[in-house]
Each structure stands twice: as C-alpha cells, then as structure tokens.
C-alpha cells in the first residue's frame, strides 16, 4: 500500500481467483483513543472499533472510503483504491490502446517546435467518475523540472456504438534551450482513477522525436503572365522555432486532380515556392517537416486551383 | 557564446554542402546498423545516450545562433579554448566566435573519426563479418574536416591488445552512431545558419 495523495491510498493486488489479497491496517487520524468506530462509504454498518482497523483487501467491494467516527462526529477519512496486477502485468482498462506508432501506446505526445512545450493526449470510453493527474520530468534518476497543467476533456467522438473521449494536457520544460542536444528523455506519468480503480501510464521520449510542425501558412497562388502556370508560395508556420535559418524546414508539395483516381504528383523542396501547372478542379497541398531530423510531417495546407 | 551575423563571400558557404553529405551518410549508416543488428539493442529507445565529446568540446554553445543568446537556458558556463584559424568561410571577416564554433566542430569530427576507425579495425576481426563502417561516411567526415581546414595535431588511433568483445563493440557502434547523428544535425543547422548570415 502507498499514499497517492493526502488520505488516498493505493493497494496493489495480484488479481487471480481466490487470491489472498492484502492485509491493510488503517489508523484514525485523531488524538482520541476510545469510542472510535469505522464505516465504509455510505453504509452505517460498523466494521470495527478502536483507533486502528485491520482489513483484508481482495476485491473492489473492499475498497472505498473508510471513515472513523466518535459520537456521530467524523474524525478522518481514508480512501482505498485498487491497482490490479494480472499475470505480472498492471491493468490498463481505463485507457484505450491507440496502437500508433506501436501496440500498447496509451499516451501520445507531440511538440510544434523545440521550445520544450509539448502536448500529450489519451483516449477512453469512460464518461464519468474519472480523474487524471499528470507529472513529468526530464530524466528519472536526477529529474529536471517539467510543469504540466491539468488534463482536460479535449474531444468527443462517436466510434460505432461507443462514444470515445479524448483528454489532453500541456507541459513545458522549465529551462529548455531549443538548440540543445537531448541526452535524457522526457518522462510523462499519468495517474488515472475510475471509481475505485487506479492505473498509471507512462511515456518516455525526446522532444526531437515528437516534433510535428504546424502546416505551412499563407499558401498562395499567383498566376504567371501568358501561361497556365501559377507561382505557389508559402511561409514557415508562426509556431516554428526561430531563427528559421538554423531550425530549417523541408516541404512536400502535392498536386492532386479532381478525382482521387488521378495520379498525384509530389516533390520535396527546401524552398518556399514552386511553379505549378494549375488544371481545373485540381488542388495544391503543402506540408512541412524538420529539414535535418526526420520526425513527423505536418498536416497539409491546401488551396484549390480555380 | 554565440555566432555574430557575418557576411561570407558570395556563393554557397563551402561547408554546407559537406555537412549535408555528412548527415546523409551517418543517417544511412545508422539505418543500416539498425537493420543489420536487429537482434541487438540498437534503437533510440534501447541504447544509452552517450556523448564522447562531453566536456571536451562545446559545439552547441559555441555555435549558438545570435537570436538564442537571450535564452538563459542556452548559455552554459562551459568554457573551452580552441585553435582559431578556420577557413571555411573563405573570408578574412571570420570572427573569433565563428572560428571558435568551427574549430569545435572540427574537434568533434576528429574525435568521432578516431573512434570509428578504432571500431572498424575491431569489426574487421569479427569472424561473423556482420557489419563494417561505411567507407563513404568516413570519407565524408574527412572531406568536412579538410573544408574546415584547421591545423591540429593528429590523434593516434587507439589500439587495444585484449581480444575484442564483438557484442560490446556492436552495441558501442550503435551508441556512437546515434550520438554522431545528433551532432551531425547540429552541424547541419549551424552551417545552414552561417550560409544564410
């Protein structure tokens, strides 16, 4: 058993049929010695008396809020949560496996630049009685500070018969140099509590590996005189690290005909313009990627040819 | 510790081309190592990230763009003195700070070159003949060092009398390649910045 926060404790259980469970001793936080009784949750049934209560925790029915009283007055609470271990593996029932970039990916994180700011998100099908708490650091043995905000519900989607909820959190490394060469990864730890079930999820990454620039901005077409051609130009996104001559991007330019069957033409360029033959109903799209360290491509910025 | 904006002679900054080739070569070599050594811990997640130049050179700090010198977190107090007669800019206007930056890059390359050559000598003795260093990568390191044109005493190749442990050597190769790729990215960024200045 260990303390998650004040008056909230996590009991770690090996979860299998007829498991013996864990013996837990609860102590009432009071100077009083006599006349103390214990109850669980909303029930008025007295579970025991005395300053301490010994219980055998085997299943969710044994978890919950234990309260010690004296003469109708509440003295203190202890909330017991369960953390299940099945076949040596901690349960992951609360969050959905996103399977990207690999199986058992519950947390996904992205950064728009090298400032040390990043966003993580996760998915669940649970809609109520759910709380998250997020901690992060650079490295684990001698951790350096990363500050995370509160996790918030950022999207709701319908997937078949189920509703899916996306939560996200923003974190910022306390003292980040955009030009630094990372040797210790960022660690992100999410505590998830659903009713009386506790689970924790972790992710470890270098900022350089989770970079995904915003799409290029100001994608524009300028017709060229006496020609079917247009000059396509775009700019670095505002959120990208500066100076741009140091933090350079490379771009993918794609021309797609009206029908999806038509063959796409695409090129890669370090420049911020190209010349395109603009056919009716075609569209021109541009996306960006760090020029020197190939992490994710941005989403496409698109403009119709008409 | 920063790069003042300098005005190189017209035309392509001579080292940019070489640094692009360096990054391409080390990325290809790392990819080859990951594929060939698939049953060894050779991915970014599996290896320990070590920097053989730590406390010996200070490329990131010495080559910091002017715009980042206002960022307290970027200003490390490490001081290292370097030879300052680089000719990469092909211009007498090469500032002291820029020479410091370029000589730091040169020292990095020299250190990695020695490590890679020593390692290759060991790998050539492996009866499995599983992996060797790409000669193109070694040649590209050499070309960039020549373009940087610093006079520096040659470091003798490390030789070892004990029987090489090929498993450890291959893991060390992965560690070195990962670290060298990260440094090659920094070098490319620096050269691109200097080219635009």
């Amino acid at each position: 058993i260990w303390e998650l926060k004040k008056d909230v404790y996590v009991v770690e259980l090996d979860w299998y049929p007829d498991a013996p469970g864990e013996m837990v001793v609860l102590t009432c936080d009071t100077p009083e010695e006599d006349g103390i009784t214990w109850t669980l949750d909303q029930s008025s049934e007295v579970l025991g008396s005395g300053k301490t209560l010994t219980i055998q925790v085997k299943e969710f029915g044994d978890a919950g809020q234990y309260t010690c009283h004296k003469g109708g007055e509440v003295l203190s609470h202890s909330l017991l949560l369960l953390h299940k271990k099945e076949d040596g593996i901690w349960s992951t029932d609360i969050l959905k496996d996103q399977k990207e970039p690999k199986n058992k990916t519950f947390l996904r994180c992205e950064a728009k630049n090298y400032s040390g700011r990043f966003t993580c998100w996760w998915l669940t099908t649970i809609s109520t009685d759910l709380t998250f708490s997020v901690k992060s650091s650079r490295g684990s043995s001698d951790p350096q500070g990363v500050t995370c905000g509160a996790a918030t519900l950022s999207a709701e989607r319908v997937r078949g018969d189920n509703k899916e909820y996306e939560y996200s959190v923003e974190c910022q490394e306390d003292s980040a140099c955009p030009a630094a060469e990372e040797s210790l990864p960022i660690e992100v730890m999410v505590d998830a509590v659903h009713k009386l079930k506790y689970e924790n999820y972790t992710s470890s990454f270098f900022i350089r590996d989770i970079i995904k620039p915003d799409p290029p901005k100001n994608l524009q077409l300028k017709p060229l005189k006496n020609s079917r051609q247009v000059e396509v130009s775009w700019e670095y996104p505002d959120t990208w690290s500066t100076p741009h001559s140091y933090f350079s991007l490379t771009f993918c330019v794609q021309v797609q005909g009206k029908s999806k069957r038509e063959k796409k033409d695409r090129v890669f360029t370090d420049k911020t313009s190209a010349t395109v033959i603009c056919r009716k109903n075609a569209s021109i799209s541009v996306r960006a990627q760090d020029r020197y360290y190939s992490s994710s491509w941005s989403e496409w910025a698109s403009v119709p040819c008409s | 510790r920063n790069l003042p904006v300098a005005t190189p002679d017209p035309g392509m900054f001579p080292c940019l081309h070489h640094s692009q080739n360096l990054l391409r070569a080390v990325s290809n070599m790392l990819q080859k190592a990951r594929q060939t050594l698939e049953f060894y811990p050779c991915t970014s997640e599996e290896i320990d990230h070590e920097d053989i130049t730590k406390d010996k050179t200070s490329t990131v700090e010495a080559c910091l763009p002017l715009e980042l010198t206002k960022n307290e977190s970027c200003l490390n107090s490490r001081e290292t003195s370097f030879i300052t007669n680089g000719s990469c800019l092909a211009s007498r206007k090469t500032s002291f700070m820029m020479a410091l930056c370029l000589s730091s890059i040169y020292e990095d390359l020299k250190m990695y070159q020695v490590e890679f050559k020593t390692m290759n000598a060991k790998l050539l003795m492996d009866p499995k003949r599983q992996i060797f260093l790409d000669q193109n990568m070694l040649a590209v390191i050499d070309e960039l060092m020549q373009a940087l044109n610093f006079n520096s005493e040659t470091v003798p190749q490390k030789s070892s009398l004990e029987e090489p442990d090929f498993y450890k050597t291959k893991i060390k190769l992965c560690i070195l390649l990962h670290a060298f790729r990260i440094r090659a990215v920094t070098i490319d960024r620096v050269m691109s910045y200097l080219n635009a200045s």
Partner: nanobody, 124 residues
C-alpha cells in the same frame, strides 16, 4: 536505371535562344524527377531548373527565372530546357540529371544519374 544523353547546345549571340533536349533510355522515365544543372569553368555545378515526374511542378534558380522553361514529354522519354534572352554569364556545360525523389534546392548530390553534358556558349 535510366541513361541520359543531352543535345542542342552550341554558340549563340546574347539575347538569342537555344533549346536543349535530354533523351532517356529506360522504361521508367516517368518515375524520375529531372533537373538541368550547369557548370562554368572553375565554378561549382549549380542548379538551373527541375521538373516533377508528370511535369506539373517545376522550379527555377533565381538567375534564370522568367527566361528559361523546363518541360518534359514522358511519351518520348525526353526533358527539354528552352533558354531565351541568353546572357554571356549563361555560358557553361549544361547537364541533365535524374533522381526518384530528390529534395529540390539541395544541389547536385540529390541526383544519382547524369548525362555527359552539352556546351552552351553565349557571345556578347
């Protein structure tokens, strides 16, 4: 693998025009980005113009923009460079090059297949 042969070079007066052709042998011509490069005596090889696989996307070096036009005919396995308003500084050996997915703007190292070159001389 493609093989490339340039033609159409020659001597021309300043202000005149030339049309260079680059013929490719190989059935996979339309899988390649094509580029024209040039090299003047004592200088580095530099990019002139590049064209995408279907010919829809093109790019030009600033020093030839508005004067040169790159095009291709995939049925004939040929790429062209129409050079108008020629200047003495355009004098160089012009090379045709091919690559499957080069990064434009990064210079000759992105291209793996080259022609032998054709001389263009512009007299004043």
């Amino acid at each position: 693998e493609v093989q490339l042969v340039e033609s159409g070079g020659g001597l021309v007066q300043a202000g005149g025009s030339l049309r260079l052709s680059c013929a490719s042998s190989g059935r996979t011509f339309s899988n390649y980005n094509m580029g024209w490069f040039r090299q003047a005596p004592g200088k580095e090889r530099e990019s002139v113009a590049t064209i995408s696989r279907s010919g829809v996307i093109t790019d030009y070096a600033d020093y030839v923009k508005g004067r040169f036009t790159i095009s291709r005919d995939n049925a004939k396995n040929t790429v062209y460079l129409q050079m108008d308003s020629l200047k003495p500084e355009d004098t160089a050996v012009y090379y045709c090059a091919a690559a499957r997915s080069p990064v434009w703007g990064r210079g000759p190292d992105e291209y793996d297949t080259w022609g032998q070159g054709t001389q263009v001389t512009v007299s004043s």
